[in-house]
Interface confidence: low
């Protein structure tokens, strides 16, 4: 329905205070490097105008789309080109290309200080001191983080971080009540903003297309009992959804969740028998349940997929008549009598199924042809099988510290050239795959450690994309989205690369690493483990071990001695000696 | 308004054909597995025949198959039901009935139905 | 091939609770569906997948299924829920929409 002017209509719809957190998330996510004062005077702006257009529709510029509204205020910003240098050409476009042009200088790694914690009482003080500039704060910090975090959930995000201040500021122990809860948030508002920047990646790189697929089988696979026609309902406006977040429109985006929210609770009887709590929370919460909920139970009376797909002397009619549709019938088939599979995997097999389509429809016979298709799924299923029971055994024996660092030196072979960082980070969070996934029987691990996987490879791909130094990331990167574990996970080492020359204030550490947390005292280890394997691509498990080993009782025997800077200073020298005669570099 | 309409019952003699038809409305078609039911005189309800979304597979009981032919034609909302070397046990209260999307039951909605009448 | 048993006729008084059952070999593997039929009429599904109510079906109309038996519940029996009952499944081993005989309810 046509709105006379769209900034008064999403206003009314999400209330002031959604209006203006969606309003300051957005900015942040566009201008990362404007100071918080900068950004909430523009809100203001923004909002007391979208009033005057509330109290009259008619009003000067009140017509204009909010791309237009909201671009003409971020090209305001006084020090746009000297802060975003050529960002500040895209002011000088008209939409929709400036808005294009602003999406695409959204920065994955922004160069902002870390976040550091304050002490509890600072924070407690500051929250009762100003509620609404404590929790404002918080809404631009990780906005301007993570461009691409899901608006509608950072305000669930939001509402939580309140909540945890709200109860632990009164609370006899402050500390033992807030800090585990922020570190709960913490966690989860990284794994939220990596599942997200998945979405948005198979969004642009994959196109609508791509990222319906997707919904398709997850969706088959959550509410197995939902026709056809109901999940593909559940898809398209689903995809409608997370294009508008993904491309910056976070007003319509989180309207139209809580829409689709509302829609999906309205017909829970036709889509799952799992949603009955969800549907009685608040909006926010209702939202993020629906989003998180487990699988439905398989419906008991499913007919063989074989009749339709394979036996049926009319697939090609079918599939001619409609070749989405039918391969979307094919996957909606597939997925919700797999909950067992991960999405990644239903989609390769959709694939095979499309290409075998695509060759046996033109052939001769066509059914002689394709009748045996689903023979060529079990080597696509048992690969991801195969290889989440070997990496769960070796979870299981090494720890998930250890587990890390194999993969770590796993993954340096294959692309040398990725930054250091990246690949401490990104080889950290494949690690975490261990806990997070091998404790679920065989039925669950699939779909856990590989749909995990995707999300962390994307990381990999979106901070290799602003800096490109690997043909062989950018290879396994844009070919296929839903091939992209499998093509990692068959690289080998990689034979070109030159190694790296020795320098050794790489491997020099000072007293400092004594005083860090147990997770920054690993980064430090795991640097220092990339480190080498770049200095030594060829170097065995057993001289990486025995060199690790030795670092890790140099650190503690310096960390307990009474002048710790002057043993890391001449005990580091010794330990560099022995590890390049033991590596010999 | 989800409408369901059978039609071309009637009168036939053993060993003859007929074809009833079932003209839907109020609903998209197309997406819906389909079915026939019937209910002899007396007697309770036996499912006789069912066809996938497409058209592309059909689902016979044992009573008739390679005598009773199921079709569809999604372009004008209609479903077939042709019946071949009858008998006069096939005489009963033929019902159109609209399964789900993949499972064929339950049956949520039902025509009137159409007589059909085997006899000599 | 399948077979579904109902016996073929229940009595209950008004407003009391009537318990319609249908015997399959392990039906509580499949999605059972529960039909009303009044005379003359063509049949309503009042119960599907086991337990749960298509819209405008009354609340007394309910419905379990496990181990080797289906039942459909009518709690706080009404004149007007007389009528011929019948339960289905769907056998994935035929490929074939199994009904049961039909179980009359009389409310007294």
């Known amino acids: 329905d046509a709105h006379k002017s769209e900034v008064a209509h999403r206003f009314k719809d999400l209330g002031e205070e959604n209006f203006k957190a969606l309003v300051l998330i957005a900015f942040a996510q566009y201008l990362q490097q404007c100071p918080f004062e900068d950004h909430v005077k523009l809100v203001n702006e923004v909002t007391e105008f979208a009033k005057t257009c509330v109290a009259d529709e008619s009003a000067e510029n009140c017509d204009k789309s909010l791309h237009t509204l909201f671009g003409d205020k971020l090209c305001t910003v006084a020090t746009l080109r000297e802060t975003y240098g050529e960002m500040a050409d895209c002011c000088a476009k008209q939409e929709p290309e400036r808005n294009e042009c602003f999406l695409q200088h959204k920065d994955d790694n922004p160069n902002l200080p870390r976040l550091v914690r304050p002490e509890v009482d600072v924070m407690c003080t500051a929250f009762h001191d100003n509620e609404e500039t404590f929790l404002k704060k918080y809404l631009y910090e990780i906005a301007r983080r993570h461009p691409y975090f899901y608006a509608p959930e950072l305000l669930f995000f939001a509402k939580r971080y309140k909540a945890a201040f709200t109860e632990c500021c009164q609370a006899a122990d402050k500390a033992a009540c807030l800090l585990p809860k922020l570190d709960e948030l913490r966690d989860e508002g990284k794994a939220s903003s990596a599942k997200q920047r998945l979405k948005c990646a198979s969004l642009q790189k994959f196109g609508e297309r791509a990222f319906k697929a997707w919904a398709v089988a997850r969706l088959s696979q959550r509410f197995p009992k939902a026709e056809f026609a109901e999940v593909s309902k559940l898809v398209t406006d689903l995809t409608k959804v997370h294009t508008e977040c993904c491309h910056g429109d976070l007003l319509e985006c989180a309207d139209d969740r809580a829409d689709l929210a509302k829609y999906i609770c309205e017909n829970q009887d036709s889509i799952s028998s799992k949603l009955k709590e969800c549907c009685e929370k608040p909006l926010l919460e209702k939202s993020h349940c629906i989003a998180e909920v487990e699988n439905d139970e398989m419906p008991a009376d499913l007919p063989s997929l074989a009749a339709d797909f394979v036996e049926s002397k009319d697939v090609c009619k079918n599939y001619a008549e409609a070749k989405d549709v039918f391969l979307g019938m094919f996957l909606y088939e597939y997925a919700r009598r797999h909950p067992d599979y991960s999405v990644v995997l239903l989609l390769r097999l959709a694939k095979t199924y499309e290409t075998t389509l695509e060759k046996c429809c033109a052939a001769a016979d066509p059914h002689e042809c394709y009748a045996k298709v689903f023979d060529e799924f079990k080597p696509l299923v048992e690969e991801p099988q195969n290889l989440i029971k070997q990496n769960c055994e070796l979870f299981e024996q090494l720890g998930e510290y250890k587990f890390q660092n194999a993969l770590l030196v796993r993954y340096t072979k294959k692309v040398p050239q990725v930054s250091t960082p990246t690949l401490v980070e990104v080889s950290r969070n494949l690690g975490k795959v261990g806990s997070k996934c091998c404790k679920h029987p065989e039925a669950k691990r699939m779909p856990c450690a590989e749909d995990y996987l995707s999300v962390v490879l994307n990381q990999l791909c979106v901070l290799h994309e602003k800096t490109p130094v690997s043909d062989r990331v950018t290879k396994c990167c844009t070919e296929s989205l839903v091939n992209r574990r499998p093509c990692f996970s068959a690289l080998e080492v990689d034979e070109t690369y030159v190694p790296k020359e020795f320098n050794a204030e790489t491997f020099t550490f000072h007293a400092d690493i004594c005083t860090l947390s147990e997770k920054e005292r690993q980064i430090k280890k795991q640097t220092a483990l990339v480190e080498l394997v770049k200095h030594k691509p060829k170097a065995t498990k057993e001289q990486l071990k025995a060199v690790m080993d030795d670092f890790a009782a140099f650190v503690e025997k310096c960390c307990k001695a009474d002048d710790k800077e002057t043993c890391f200073a001449e005990e580091g020298k010794k330990l560099v000696a022995a590890s390049q005669a033991a590596l010999g570099l | 308004e989800l409408q369901l309409v059978e039609s071309g019952g009637g009168l036939v003699q053993p060993g003859g054909s007929l074809r009833v038809s079932c003209a839907a409305s109020g609903f998209t078609f197309s997406h819906y597995y389909m079915n026939w039911v019937r209910q002899a005189p007396g007697k309770g309800l036996e499912w006789v025949s069912g066809i996938n979304t497409g058209g592309g597979t059909t689902y016979y009981a044992d009573s008739v198959k390679g005598r009773f032919t199921i079709s569809r034609d999604n372009a004008k909302n209609t479903l077939y039901l042709q019946m071949n070397s009858l008998k006069p046990e096939d005489t009963a209260l033929y019902y159109c009935?609209?399964?789900?999307?993949?499972?064929?039951?339950?049956?949520?909605?039902w025509g009137q139905g159409t007589q059909v009448t085997v006899s000599s | 091939s399948y077979e579904l048993t109902q016996s073929p006729s229940v009595s209950v008084a008004l407003r009391q609770t009537a318990k319609i059952t249908c015997g399959g070999d392990n039906i509580g593997s499949k999605n059972a569906h529960w039909y009303q039929q009044k005379p003359g009429q063509a049949p309503v599904l009042v119960i599907y997948?086991?337990?749960n109510r298509p819209s405008g079906i009354p609340e007394r109309f309910s419905g379990s299924n496990s181990g080797n038996t289906a039942t459909l519940t009518v709690s706080g029996a009404q004149a007007e829920d007389e009528a011929d009952y019948y339960c289905?499944?769907?056998?994935?081993?035929?490929?074939?929409?199994?009904f049961g005989g039909g179980t009359h309810l009389t409310v007294l």
């Open positions: 997948k086991d337990s």
């Open positions: 289905q499944v769907w056998d994935s081993s035929a490929n074939a929409a199994v």
């Open positions: 009935a609209k399964g789900g999307i993949v499972a064929v039951g339950g049956f949520g909605s």
